[in-house]
């Protein structure tokens, strides 16, 4: 029995709601009776979900998951996974058992978007060419960890004293602390780029320093 | 040609477990279902329990519950089969089998071992 | 749990003859019925699966069919080296389990 699921993980935002397809191909004269799905963790072989002697058993997965009741005839053996948690990431075998069984795995890769990073100098005042000065740029509960970049005014990237931390807090989301010291020239704007690997989504942050005042777009 | 190769010959004391295994050598256990039938002398065919890998979940016959335990190590392409608070009853020679894959049939099968329980 | 009987018992035959082995279920199995052959002091070999259908490398003269709770194995002409028990066996659909009759023996007549 030839069961299909994408080859591509599927991507989820953080609290919102996944399909992860799964498929096969019934036989003519098939009916639900003879159909046993079961959905399950591919590592652990925790039970998700299943489907057996033609009734849906229900979700033994936090009460958050659900299979598509009208489409299960023609062979839509999809699962839906309500409200996305960090922790739901990873693989889920699709297990469907007819006359001869087969099983394929889907991969769950869950997303959530970095917020606009905020920008604190440290001295932040009183500032003149030649001071040594720390950029700190925070970005807080994205998921997965960020890629991190800073640049000058000029757009060259700045990879030197470059500190960057990265802390999950009890959902499993990062907030992101960057620090770049820096040796001030006259004038100076300072770009950092928050960048979600997954979502290809960029947050941007800058700071400009002029003799004074400086400013914080 | 895919072979069963089943673990060897046992003698065990009434009371013990015997533990019998049984290796895929096309190293695909995974895609299987894998069954353990016995056989006493000169009887019948009787069906122990079973196993589906992928899944992890193993079943077993009525008369066999809570004395069989048949597991499956996916990483050796391995199963095995214990049955505990062995009878003289219980000797027979026990049999691996599974079908192709993602099939229900038992058309391969372990050349059989032979367990003896005597005091 | 579903009982299977096979019948007969024993089934004395010549070489060229055809054979008719019975298997009656105690109540209906669909279509996951299946027969397999043992030779003394070997591993059974699968016959045939789901009522009719051959297995890999069987010859033609092995046939199957019935439905519900009555089934035949039928073996048209008897070939010297088809002499030996002959099982019927059932699986159930979830969780898959299964059962045995309790053999035919084929001999020679």
């Known amino acids: 029995l030839e069961v299909q699921v994408p080859e591509d993980p599927v991507v989820a935002l953080v609290g919102t709601d996944a399909t992860l397809c799964c498929s096969f191909s019934p036989e003519p004269g098939f009916s639900l009776a003879q159909l046993n799905l079961i959905w399950q963790l591919t590592d652990t072989k925790q039970l998700v979900h299943s489907f057996a002697e033609g009734q849906d058993q229900g979700s033994a997965y936090a009460n958050r998951t659900a299979l598509f009741p009208d489409l299960l005839a023609q062979g839509n053996a999809s699962l839906r996974l309500q409200r996305v948690r960090v922790a739901d990431e990873g693989s889920f075998t699709c297990f469907v058992s007819i006359r001869d069984f087969g099983s394929a795995a889907v991969s769950l890769q869950v997303a959530a978007p970095y917020s606009k990073p905020s920008m604190t100098l440290e001295p932040n005042k009183d500032l003149r060419p030649g001071d040594t000065v720390t950029i700190t740029c925070s970005s807080y509960r994205g998921y997965p960890e960020a890629e991190v970049f800073w640049q000058d005014g000029q757009g060259v990237p700045l990879t030197g004293n470059v500190t960057t931390s990265q802390m999950a807090n009890e959902q499993g989301l990062f907030d992101v602390h960057s620090v770049l010291r820096v040796v001030l020239g006259a004038n100076g704007t300072y770009s950092c780029l928050v960048r979600n690997p997954v979502l290809q989504q960029d947050a941007h942050g800058s700071v400009t320093i002029t003799g004074q005042p400086m400013t914080f777009p | 040609q895919v072979q069963l190769q089943q673990s060897g010959a046992e003698v065990k004391k009434p009371g013990s477990s015997v533990k019998v295994s049984c290796k895929d050598s096309?190293?695909?256990?995974?895609?299987?279902?894998i069954s353990w039938v016995r056989q006493a002398p000169g009887q019948g065919l009787e069906w122990m329990g079973g196993?589906?890998?992928?899944?992890?979940?193993?079943n077993y016959a009525q008369k066999f519950q809570g004395r069989v335990t048949i597991t499956a190590d996916e990483s050796t392409s391995t199963a095995y089969m214990e049955l505990s608070s062995l009878r003289s009853e219980d000797t027979a020679v026990y049999y691996c089998?599974?079908?192709?894959?993602?099939?229900?049939?038992?058309?391969?099968w372990g050349k059989g071992t032979l367990v003896t329980v005597s005091s | 749990e579903i009982v299977l009987t096979q019948s007969p018992a024993t089934l004395s035959l010549s070489p060229g003859e055809r054979a008719t082995l019975s298997c009656r279920a105690s109540?209906?199995?669909?279509?996951?019925l299946g027969w397999y052959q043992q030779k003394p002091g070997q591993a059974p070999r699968l016959l045939i699966y789901d009522v009719s259908n051959r297995a890999s490398g069987i010859p033609a003269r092995f046939s199957g069919s019935g439905s519900g709770i009555d089934f035949t194995l039928t073996i048209s002409s008897l070939e010297p080296e088809d002499f030996a028990v002959y099982y019927c066996q059932q699986r159930s659909n979830w969780p898959p389990m299964y059962t045995f009759g309790q053999g035919t023996k084929l001999e020679i007549k």
């Open positions: 196993i589906i890998p992928i899944l992890g979940i193993a």
């Open positions: 089998a599974r079908g192709g894959p993602g099939s229900y049939h038992m058309d391969v």
């Open positions: 109540q209906s199995v669909g279509s996951s």
């Open positions: 096309g190293g695909t256990l995974s895609s299987h279902a």
